[in-house]
């Protein structure tokens, strides 16, 4: 059982979205009096993995050759010392892409956006899907989400984004999924190039900058939910 | 639970200065751009400043451009709108707005009232 | 600028009755209508976002329509708490405009 030890750290190898068929290293980092490590993974026989620890004992590698639908999910790791288990670690959600056909993205009205107007990034899939994620390459939040707008299945979601300013350009591609098996995504959709215009080069606006001049830069992460940017499978239901 | 608190408001005379202040808790602060709009007693809704996240994109309503400043610190999850050359027509009650990225304002303080008379 | 116009500017209504309000805009602003309700003394709160999207908590007696120029929201039965002005907003380009409000009353 959890005693007073601190829990461990949790993390995959080289990231926790994985295309079907490549391989995966979990790892579960606890402290050099661990003893041995177990990986639990939710909706799973526990423990769904044991490991002795790697020299110096502090960490153990919990390792997947090829990603398949089986492992998806939601994985914990836990660590035994001498004193006994420690708290679960924070969990890792391993999300596999490539279950589903890839869908279309596209920007409404048009991919080339002037600095202080809106967007809106529109994901297409052929069979209805019931959640739609978006990405944005080389994002400090990678990975964001949203839930189709209506509890059932469609075809398509609509990520709208206002005001746009030049943090809003870049490479973004698609995903879409069913609420069933949220770990379980479609191929990636051909990325989609947004470019944001009327920007300046200095990052610093003068403070009488009035709305018909074009913004400047901006580190605003990327919010089309309006809430903070998820890294992993955190939703945010509409 | 989101919650936005203004303060700064009062009577200050035509040609004045005041700065309000936006407390903001239950939310990450630094995540989301802000706003401030404004509503003369009696009137409709007029939106007047607009700061992104970081501070380095602003934007203003022409009725305000170069006399009113919007600034932020996320050290302090605070808003400021610091208003000079003030005049009678910017008489209102202000409102702090968290932007929702999506062209929204999804929370709303409860406004600080600035009369400019003399 | 965008200008929005929004009508009536008041209306009266019974409880249970639908109450449709419309919002007009004067160029193209695709889907970015919002709207919100206003009582007495109190700060605006956002009831619908992006034409038809209604925010967390909003009771689902609330909806929204419409693209490109001309929006509707609606009240499909009136509640005594529904007394309020509500406003529509376009947040497609800045600077952000608003209607001119729509003062709702019980007869």
């Known amino acids: 059982q959890a005693g007073p030890l601190p829990k461990p750290t949790l993390w995959a190898e080289p990231g926790s979205v994985i295309s079907w068929g490549n391989s995966v290293t979990i790892w579960c980092q606890g402290t050099l009096e661990a003893r041995e490590y177990r990986l639990d993974k939710e909706e799973s026989p526990a423990p769904w993995d044991r490991q002795n620890p790697l020299e110096p004992k502090n960490k153990a590698r919990f390792s997947i050759p090829s990603m398949t639908e089986d492992y998806a999910g939601r994985y914990r790791c836990y660590y035994r010392s001498p004193v006994g288990w420690s708290q679960p670690s924070d969990p890792l959600e391993l999300v596999m892409t490539g279950a589903y056909s890839k869908p279309t993205l596209s920007a409404l009205p048009s991919p080339l956006v002037t600095s202080g107007k809106s967007v809106t990034l529109l994901c297409q899939s052929r069979s209805p899907m019931d959640t739609f994620l978006l990405i944005k390459e080389r994002a400090a939040h990678p990975l964001l989400h949203l839930r189709s707008e209506h509890g059932a299945q469609q075809h398509q979601a609509e990520f709208p984004m206002s005001p746009v300013t030049s943090v809003h350009g870049g490479t973004y591609r698609c995903f879409s999924s069913h609420g069933f098996s949220h770990y379980l995504l479609s191929h990636p959709s051909d990325p989609l190039e947004l470019i944001v215009s009327g920007s300046l080069e200095d990052p610093r606006p003068s403070p009488t900058r009035s709305v018909s001049t074009a913004a400047g830069p901006e580190d605003q992460p990327l919010m089309p939910t309006g809430s903070v940017p998820h890294s992993g499978l955190r939703r945010h239901w509409e | 639970e989101v919650q936005l608190v203004e303060s700064g408001g009062g009577l200050v005379q035509p040609g004045g200065s005041l700065r309000l202040s936006c407390a903001a808790s239950?939310?990450?602060?630094?995540?989301?751009?802000m706003h401030w709009v404004r509503q003369a007693p009696g009137k409709g809704l007029e939106w007047v400043a607009y700061?992104?996240?970081?501070?380095?994109?602003?934007y203003y309503a022409d009725t305000v451009k170069g006399r009113f400043t919007i600034s932020r610190d996320n050290a302090k999850n605070s808003l400021y709108l610091q208003m000079n050359s003030l005049r009678a027509e910017d008489t209102a009650v202000y409102y702090c707005?968290?932007?929702?990225?999506?062209?929204?304002?999804?929370?709303w303080g409860q406004g600080t009232l600035v009369t400019v008379s003399s | 600028d965008i200008q929005m116009t929004q009508s009536p500017s008041s209306l009266s209504a019974s409880v249970g009755d639908r109450v449709t309000i419309t919002c007009r805009a004067s160029q193209d602003i695709s889907k970015f209508l919002n709207w919100y309700q206003q009582k007495p003394g109190k700060a605006p709160k956002l009831l619908i976002y992006y034409t038809s999207r209604l925010h967390s908590g909003v009771p689902s007696r609330f909806s929204g329509s419409g693209s490109g120029t001309d929006f509707t929201f609606t009240i499909s039965s009136l509640q005594p708490e529904d007394i309020a002005t509500y406003f529509c907003q376009q947040g497609n380009t800045l600077p952000w405009t608003f209607g001119g409000g729509t003062k709702l009353e019980i007869k």
């Open positions: 700061i992104f996240s970081g501070s380095s994109t602003i």
């Open positions: 707005a968290r932007a929702d990225g999506r062209g929204a304002m999804d929370y």
């Open positions: 239950g939310f990450t602060f630094s995540d989301y751009g």
